[in-house]
Interface confidence: low
């Protein structure tokens, strides 16, 4: 019968010929009367056989990632009779893996959006690299992820590539971050190959800023001839948030005279001071009112940033109109 062990040849061998192994019939007594033949895809081009000894050699550099095994056939013939000594047999030469492929991030570009002020541990995104080397061959395709850029705001789980927040971020200070992740094979041991990817992380706004009046004092005038409903001026607050988190509502906090009202222009985000009752210069020639501003939408969990509304003082001077 045939005698052989499993055949392996390392990929990417630079030698002109590499001894793979030996085919032998147990009927071969070593008197050189047997002739060994190699058949099948790769025989004669990739692999050759010493017909006398049955030794097999690889004569080409192999790439496991291109082809990981070769199925060949072996024959042994008695030279004196020209007959087969053994039945033709199929055997396999496996190409063994070396670490010749770096990890690659196939889903680039990566982009994620996460709310500002998110707590430590919040999941941002998972990045995944793949390695063409053999996952069953040692650590050639076992990857470890690490953060090259993004500290101290982000961290990456070494084995999963999950990026998490590690420090609170304020969108109003910086609204996006570039994080660079490295994947190393060989679980980071010497000889490891690496690949990197960039992740753009954008911060979405949360309502962590209350609106604040631009001025602590406004001065307005109203004619004593102005009818009720007249707009006598505008006041304005600013809010460092964006979108609906910056929408605000103005109102009267203090007006003992109950002469004025404030309505909100939601398009311009201004407060419009309205005359609610006619004024009379002789009766009262100036008024002081206090206005406040609050966000229109406030998440209950963010109430701590909105416990005290910003206020402003408005001095209103009544203009005298000559009466006939």
């Amino acid at each position: 019968g045939w005698v052989w062990n499993q055949f392996f040849v390392p990929e990417e061998m630079n030698t002109t010929s590499h001894h793979v192994g030996r085919l032998r019939s147990d009927l071969d007594n070593g008197n050189n009367s047997f002739q060994y033949k190699l058949l099948g895809a790769g025989a004669g081009s990739t692999f050759i056989i010493d017909e006398r000894t049955g030794d097999i050699y690889a004569i080409e550099k192999l790439d496991r990632e291109e082809r990981s095994l070769y199925i060949l056939r072996a024959q042994v013939i008695d030279i004196t009779t020209g007959r087969a000594v053994e039945p033709e047999s199929e055997f396999v030469i496996k190409v063994s893996d070396i670490n010749d492929n770096e990890p690659k991030f196939l889903d680039e570009p990566y982009e994620a959006i996460v709310p500002e002020m998110s707590p430590e541990g919040t999941l941002v995104i998972q990045v995944t690299a793949s390695d063409a080397d053999d996952p069953s061959s040692g650590n050639n395709a076992r990857l470890l992820y690490s953060l090259l850029q993004g500290q101290p705001y982000f961290s990456v789980e070494p084995t999963t590539g999950v990026i998490r927040i590690s420090s609170k971020m304020d969108r109003e200070l910086q609204d996006e971050y570039w994080v660079i992740i490295q994947a190393k094979d060989m679980i980071g041991q010497p000889g490891a190959l690496s690949g990197t990817t960039s992740v753009l992380i954008k911060l979405s706004d949360v309502n962590d800023n209350k609106p604040i009046f631009k001025e602590s004092l406004y001065r307005l005038t109203v004619s004593e001839s102005a009818p009720t409903g007249t707009s006598i001026g505008t006041i304005m607050a600013y809010d460092n948030d964006i979108g609906e988190n910056a929408e605000m509502d103005y109102s009267i906090e203090e007006d003992d005279s109950q002469t004025f009202d404030i309505i909100t222009n939601h398009e311009t985000q201004e407060g419009i001071v309205i005359l609610k009752k006619k004024v009379n210069f002789e009766h009262q020639n100036h008024y002081g009112i206090r206005a406040k501003v609050k966000n229109h939408h406030v998440d209950e969990q963010l109430m701590k940033y909105h416990t005290e509304a910003s206020t402003t003082f408005i001095k209103i001077q009544v203009e005298d109109v000559d009466e006939p």
């Epitope: 430590e120 420090s167 609170k168 200070l173 962590d208 800023n209 209350k210 109430m303 701590k304 940033y305």
Partner: antibody, heavy 119, light 107 residues
Framework: QVQLVESGGGVVQPGGSLRLSCAAS????????MHWVRQAPGKGLEWVAV????????YYAESVKGRFTISRDTSKNTLYLQMNSLRAEDTAVYYC????????????WGQGTLVTVSS | EIVLTQSPGTLSLSPGERATLSCRAS???????LAWYQQKPGQAPRLLIY???SRATGIPDRFSGSGSGTDFTLTISSLEPEDFAVYYC????????FGQGTKVEIK
């Protein structure tokens, strides 16, 4: 380990001023909202003021509004309480406290510094 | 502001007994934003419970919190000698306010 150490307490006359400090260590000071809480001798706890982690928002109890100012210096990892127009009823042990990261309770407190307002 | 009322003012118990402390709010405390603190003489308060029922880091499981809305309870299942102290509840639903405290003393 997290440490908060208050200083600056002492005896002051009514109408006087005092500035308390709270040195923070063992955590990322700039990531946490910080508070002052006081306790009059033999009495309960009273919340005084809070400052947001980035120092842009401050809120005060009605009893101290307009007289006390809370501030912070991130470069020095220090929280401050400037107390003006002090009254006898401000006599208390003043504690600085760190607000818990995931909610609004106070997970770490300093040992306190005693402020006595007396003529 | 939300006013918190604790009862009883003083609780006299022996080691090994169960302690039940009550805290009532003048209006509903949203999202169970209520904490319990322990304070021993000459020391700073120590956080025991947050979110009405979650134990803070390092707090033994004999301490438990419950309740919602306006009625909250701190229970110490079996008093240890080191548990005799003053206990404060605190709401952080709307600004921050504390109860007046309950003293747990040795009977």
């Amino acid at each position: 380990q997290v440490q908060l150490v208050e200083s600056g307490g002492g005896v002051v006359q009514p109408g006087g001023s005092l500035r308390l400090s709270c040195a923070a260590s063992g955590f990322t000071f700039s990531s946490y909202d910080m508070h002052w809480v006081r306790q009059a001798p033999g009495k309960g706890l009273e919340w005084v003021a809070v400052i947001s982690y980035e120092g842009t928002n401050e809120y005060y109890a009605e009893s101290v509004k307009g007289r006390f100012t809370i501030s912070r210096d991130t470069s020095k990892n220090t929280l401050y309480l400037q107390m003006n127009s002090l009254r006898a009823e401000d006599t208390a042990v003043y504690y600085c406290a760190r607000e818990r990261y995931f909610d609004w309770s106070f997970d770490y407190w300093g040992q306190g510094t005693l402020v006595t307002v007396s003529s | 502001e939300i006013v918190l009322t604790q009862s009883p003012g003083t609780l006299s118990l022996s080691p090994g007994e169960r302690a039940t402390l009550s805290c009532r709010a003048s209006q509903s405390v949203s999202n169970t934003y209520l904490a319990w603190y322990q304070q021993k003489p000459g020391q700073a308060p120590r956080l025991l419970i947050y979110g009405a029922s979650s134990r803070a880091t390092g707090i033994p499981d004999r301490f438990s919190g419950s309740g919602s809305g306006t009625d909250f309870t701190l229970t110490i299942s079996s008093l240890e000698p080191e548990d005799f102290a003053v206990y404060y509840c605190q709401q952080y639903s709307n600004s921050w306010t504390f109860g007046q405290g309950t003293k747990v003393e040795i009977k």
